[in-house]
C-alpha cells in the first residue's frame, strides 16, 4: 500500500523555539516515521532537517538549526515505513516574520500601596530578537484577586511601578511583550500574584523638588514626622528601558546619605548632562519607609529653568505683577531662549485658600482684591514646548498689602 504524505504542516516559532506540527494522513497505518528536509533561498539542493528525522510523533523541534532568521526557508515532509510517501512541500516562510514573542519573565516586589514590576525577555540573548531586544515594550493586565476586575496598562518598560493600591491585598497580573517596530504582539506570561504588605508606619517622602542655587542642586521634600534620616538615590532614566543592564542600579547621592533634614545640597557636577530619576527614603533608626514616587530630573532644563523674579505694584483692588528674568549667581539675569508660561499663585495672608492665574505675558494683573489686606504671591515658569514640558520650582512668596479704597488708578 502506498504511503500518503502528511498534510497540514504548521510552523510555530516562539522566540528561538522552532516547532513543527502535522497531521498523519492515514491513522490506520502503524509504525510510520516522518522526516523533514529544508531548503534555503537560492539553493537547489535539499538538506536533512536535524532534529526532525525519523520522528514517530507528529511534532518536532528544529531550534538547534542555526538559521538566518531574516532569510526565507522552505520545508518538505514525507512519511516512511518500508517505503516512503511522496514529499509534501510547506509554503516557504521567513522565520522572523512568522515568529511570536514568547512570554516575558516577571519579578514582583510588594510595598504597602504599590507593586514594582521587573520584566525581562523570556529568552536570554535571543537570536530572533537580537536586533530588536532594546525595542521591547510591555503591556500588562492587573486585577485584585478578590474582584477580578481587570485594568490594562500599555507601553511600559522593563521596570514599572503601580501606585495607589490597597495594603494587605493580593493583586494578580500577566505581562506580554510587543515589538512595535515589527507590529508584533507577544504571548502573555503566566499569572503572577503578590500580596501588598501591611501599611508602613512611615509613609514615603512626598513632593520632591529640585532647584538650582549657585553651582549646587538643592533637593527638597516633605515629610510627616520629625527626627528622621533620609537617603536619596538616582538612576539614569534611559536605563529603565534597558532590561537586565547592570547599570540599571539605583545609586546613592553621597551628599544625601543619612541626611537629617528634608533637603540636601549637592554639586551640579555630580550629574553629567542627561535625564535622571530621583527617589527618597525615610528612616527613624528602627523602621524604614518604602521609596517615594520617582521624580524625573533633566539637568539641561533644571540648569536653565529657574523660578521667575517679579515686582508687585499694589493698588486697592488689584496687584500689577511685572515678571523679569531670573537671576543667576552674581545677580546676572538668565536669558531664557524658549517661550514660557507663568503660573501665579496668590492668597490672603490669613487664609489658606489659594487662587491661580496662568499667563503668557510678563505683566499680569491680579484682580478682585480687598483693600488694606495682605496678599502673598509666588510664581513659577513652565516651558511651552510639549516635548520638554518642564517647570521651575516656585519662587519664594512675596507678601504685599493692598492700598486703601479708591486708588485703583
Amino acid at each position: 500500500k502506498n504511503l500518503k504524505s502528511p498534510q497540514k504542516v504548521e510552523v510555530d516559532i516562539i522566540d528561538d523555539n522552532f516547532i513543527l506540527r502535522w497531521n498523519r494522513s492515514d491513522e490506520s497505518v502503524g509504525n510510520v516515521t516522518f522526516s523533514f528536509d529544508y531548503q534555503k533561498t537560492g539553493m537547489d539542493n535539499w538538506i536533512k532537517l536535524s532534529g526532525c528525522q525519523n520522528i514517530t510523533s507528529t511534532k518536532c523541534n528544529f531550534s538547534s538549526l542555526k538559521l538566518n532568521v531574516y532569510e526565507e526557508i522552505k520545508l518538505r515532509i514525507r512519511a516512511e515505513k518500508e517505503n516512503t510517501s511522496s514529499w509534501y512541500e510547506v509554503d516557504s516562510f521567513t522565520p522572523f516574520r512568522k515568529a511570536q514573542i514568547g512570554p516575558p519573565e516577571v519579578h514582583l516586589e510588594a510595598e504597602d500601596k504599590a507593586i514594582v514590576i521587573h520584566i525581562s525577555p523570556g529568552t536570554k540573548d535571543s537570536v530572533m530578537w537580537a536586533l530588536d531586544g532594546l525595542s521591547f515594550t510591555y503591556s500588562l493586565v492587573i486585577w485584585k484577586n478578590s474582584s477580578g476586575v481587570e485594568e490594562r496598562i500599555e507601553n511600559i518598560y522593563s521596570r514599572h511601578k503601580i501606585y495607589k493600591l490597597s495594603p494587605e491585598t493580593t493583586y494578580c497580573l500577566k505581562v506580554k511583550a510587543a515589538l512595535l517596530t515589527s507590529w508584533k504582539i507577544g504571548v502573555y506570561s503566566p499569572v503572577h500574584c503578590i500580596k501588598t504588605t501591611v501599611e508602613n508606619e512611615l509613609p514615603p517622602p512626598e513632593n520632591i523638588e529640585v532647584s538650582v542655587q549657585n553651582q549646587n542642586y538643592v533637593l527638597k521634600w516633605d515629610y510627616t514626622y520629625a527626627n528622621m534620616t533620609f537617603q536619596v538615590q538616582w538612576l539614569h532614566a534611559f536605563l529603565k528601558r534597558n532590561p537586565g543592564n547592570h547599570l540599571y542600579k539605583w545609586k546613592q547621592i553621597p551628599d544625601c546619605e543619612n541626611v537629617k533634614t528634608t533637603q540636601c545640597v549637592f554639586p551640579q557636577n555630580v550629574f553629567q548632562k542627561g535625564i535622571y530619576l530621583l527617589r527618597v527614603q525615610a528612616s527613624d533608626g528602627n523602621n524604614t519607609s518604602f521609596w517615594s514616587e520617582e521624580i524625573k530630573f533633566d539637568t539641561e532644563i533644571q540648569a536653565f529653568l529657574l523660578p521667575p523674579v517679579f515686582n508687585i505694584r499694589s493698588l486697592s483692588d488689584s496687584f500689577h505683577i511685572y515678571i523679569g528674568a531670573p537671576k543667576q549667581s552674581g545677580n546676572t539675569p538668565v536669558i531664557q531662549d524658549y517661550p514660557l508660561i507663568y503660573e501665579i499663585i496668590f492668597w490672603e495672608n490669613t487664609s489658606n485658600a489659594e487662587r491661580k492665574i496662568i499667563e503668557k505675558k510678563t505683566d499680569v494683573t491680579v484682580p478682585n482684591l480687598k483693600p488694606l489686606t495682605v496678599y502673598c504671591v509666588k510664581a513659577r515658569a513652565h516651558t511651552m514646548d510639549e516635548k520638554l514640558n518642564k517647570s521651575s520650582v516656585f519662587s519664594d512668596a512675596v507678601c504685599e498689602k493692598t492700598k486703601p479704597g479708591n486708588t485703583s488708578k
Partner: antibody, heavy 123, light 107 residues
Framework: QVQLQQPGTELVKPGSPVKLSCKAS????????LNWVQQRPGRGLEWIGK????????RYNQKFKDKATLTVDKSSNTAYIQLSSLTSEDSAVYYC????????????????WGQGTSVTVSS | DIQMTQSSSSFSVSLGDRLTITCKAS??????LAWFQQKPGNAPRLLIS???SLETGVPSRFSGSGSRKDYTLSISSLQTEDVATYYC?????????FGSGTKLEIK
Amino acid sequence: QVQLQQPGTELVKPGSPVKLSCKASGYTFTSFWLNWVQQRPGRGLEWIGKIDPSDSEIRYNQKFKDKATLTVDKSSNTAYIQLSSLTSEDSAVYYCARGGGIYYDYDGAMDYWGQGTSVTVSS
Amino acid sequence: DIQMTQSSSSFSVSLGDRLTITCKASEVIYNRLAWFQQKPGNAPRLLISGATSLETGVPSRFSGSGSRKDYTLSISSLQTEDVATYYCQQYWSSPFTFGSGTKLEIK
C-alpha cells in the same frame, strides 16, 4: 543551572589570613548580589555581608567589618572573602549565596547556596 | 539590628504530623522573610521567600504565612525527608538576620 562552587576545607594557623573563593555559573554574575554567611559548629547562621559584582559595592554586617573583606573577579565569575587574623572563634563553615537582583528596589532572598568551605583554625 | 526569634529550638514529631514553626521579628519586616531547611553537612535550602512564596521544586506540603512581625512555616504532613533544622531570616533591613533555628526530631 545556577551553581556556586566552593572548596571543601581550609586549615589555617592562628593569626594568619585566609581567602575563600566562590565560583558562580549558570546565571549572569553581575546581575545579582553575592552574600556570605558564617555557621560556627553546632550554631546558627550569621550574615557577614554582600557584594554587588557589577561595581563592587559592599554592605557589611558591622560585626564582621574588621574581620572580612569581600571582593570579586568579574572575568572569572568568582567572589572572594578574605578573613584576617584568624582565631579559633573564626572556625566555621563559610557559605556564599546568591541574593536578589541588583536592579531590584529592595533586597531579595538568598536563593542559591554554595556547599560551604569549612575553615579550621588550629596550630 | 532586627532580632529574629524562633520560639522552639526543637520539636519531637511523628511522621504524618502537621507542624507549625513560628518566627517573630523585633520590628515590622513587611513580608521580607525567608524560610530555609538545613540537613546535617549540607548548605541551607531556600523553601519560601516573601513570607508565602514557595520556591520551585519545594513540595506543596510546605507553606508560609504571616505579616508584620509574626510569621509561620507549616508542614501539612511530615515526611522522613523533612527531618532537618529550619531557619527563618529577614531581608528587610541590613544586616540580614536569622532565627536561631528549629530542629525536628522523629519521636
